[in-house]
Amino acid sequence: AGVFELQIHSFGPGPGPGAPRSPCSARLPCRLFFRVCLKPGLSEEAAESPCALGAALSARGPVYTEQPGAPAPDLPLPDGLLQVPFRDAWPGTFSFIIETWREELGDQIGGPAWSLLARVAGRRRLAAGGPWARDIQRAGAWELRFSYRARCEPPAVGTACTRLCRPRSAPSRCGPGLRPCAPLEDECEAPLVCRAGCSPEHGFCEQPGECRCLEGWTGPLCTVPVSTSSCLSPRGPSSATTGCLVPGPGPCDGNPCANGGSCSETPRSFECTCPRGFYGLRCEVSGVTCADGPCFNGGLCVGGADPDSAYICHCPPGFQGSNCEKRVDRCSLQPCRNGGLCLDLGHALRCRCRAGFAGPRCEHDLDDCAGRACANGGTCVEGGGAHRCSCALGFGGRDCRERADPCAARPCAHGGRCYAHFSGLVCACAPGYMGARCEFPVHPDGASALPAAPPGLRPGDPQRYL
């Protein structure tokens, strides 16, 4: 166990052109506060994925009012450290998100308004017990300077806070089987300390923080007796005493969620749905009021004037969770076309298009008519990932470069003879038929089935098809 500590040194305009406007004004004075979110490992997770290592909110900074005409200075900061306690081993590699929030103190209906000013994120390696690490991160035109460290809480020591040390009981040496605790040579490695709450009767451990169950007991703290009354639904190892299969422990056995939280299994472990007033991986963080700004992503906090009364976060569209900390999966609707990959950036959806496609939703087919010409007066028609030319009469082929034989398809009906012509084809109709393709019979009485032929054309005359 231990604590991650974050010290904010400054938040203000970064170097270079385009200094940001001050977030506060004489009409709308404001103050800053910070939120840190920690996750184990070096994964590039979305901002709204759970803060599995923990999260913390700072106090509010001093009220700031912009001085007219003055450039935006470094803004006044809250006092003190942001501290994120961690219960288990320090992972050594971690991802962080630090959000800078503005609380506007003007005449807001329904209390102060919060808005996110900047969010920085990074992935770092850090050994517990080491010195403060300094960092500078930029978010747009803003710059955040900060330091951080991880320290172990006694009796834990070491780079992962997994070794446990106690003061020596005798001046000269440690107890049987226990070594001196370097670098604290005046202390000794302590006996293993199992996970907090691990049943002393039914549980044991071989690693610090572990809780392994004796046969017949289950749950994260080995407090749940395994039922042997029914052996109808096996899912675990065989019990030596009864000879029947008993359920193996699931991640929600014994309900790891505190304060009335409900547990649901996930592919990797479990997730707690916390009641109002509680949050954290196991719903262990409480005593939060609306003054602490528990609603993220622009959520509106209602109630919760004191730590004993619950608050409710009214989330803006697209956000959910008891603290509006989770984003709705908009990419599940698959808005990207033509096999594009959807990315939800929070403020907008982005599509990463496959080769040959472009546009905000990959709707433009680059393989189509862009830069393609159809020869000999042909026109390009888009469709289906490949361009196609609609050729002028007398031409064919993919790009209308081939001279076509207009008579190849035998276009003249009823035995009419076809003649190729520079502007198309001409049908010479057999007696008794007329029309551009000899398609109309001439009635025995001399009248055609359609309006009379144009002047100068007799039935049987060749007719040119334009």
């Epitope: 908009r330 808005p335 033509n338 959806l349 905000p360 939703r361 709707e363």
Partner: nanobody, 119 residues
């Protein structure tokens, strides 16, 4: 700005049916993708059914064979026909759409309509 207005929610017995409607209104917009999400108390908001950007219908596994999504392009309306309803279908159902306005795409949510399935 595009408005999405849902209707058709209500209380129904297990095994019963309901038809939800979502009407999109506004000026000079075209719908790229549109569908239905639902959120049960204390749970995440998840996609139920929708028309993707490619115009293909997509369904959550839990509703396949029971729910059918359809659309009337002339009315800019999408429907969700829900049959063989179960208690676990109880939720607020939200219409959502990815909409092109001018050259930009924006995401819009409706206010939601409550569906309650109980004996």
């Amino acid at each position: 700005e595009v408005q999405l207005v849902e209707s058709g929610g209500g209380e129904v017995q297990p095994g019963g049916s309901l038809r939800l409607s979502c009407a999109a209104s506004g000026s000079d917009f075209s719908i790229n993708a549109i569908g239905w999400y639902r959120q049960a108390p204390g749970k995440q908001r998840d996609l139920v059914a929708g028309f993707t950007g490619d115009g293909v219908t997509t369904y959550a596994e839990s509703v396949k064979g029971r729910f059918t999504i359809s659309r009337d392009n002339a009315k800019n309306t999408v429907y969700l026909q829900m049959s063989s309803l179960r208690a676990e279908d109880t939720a607020v159902y939200y219409c959502a759409a990815d909409v092109k306005i001018g050259g930009d795409y924006e995401w819009f949510w409706g206010q939601g309509t409550l569906v309650t399935v109980k004996p």
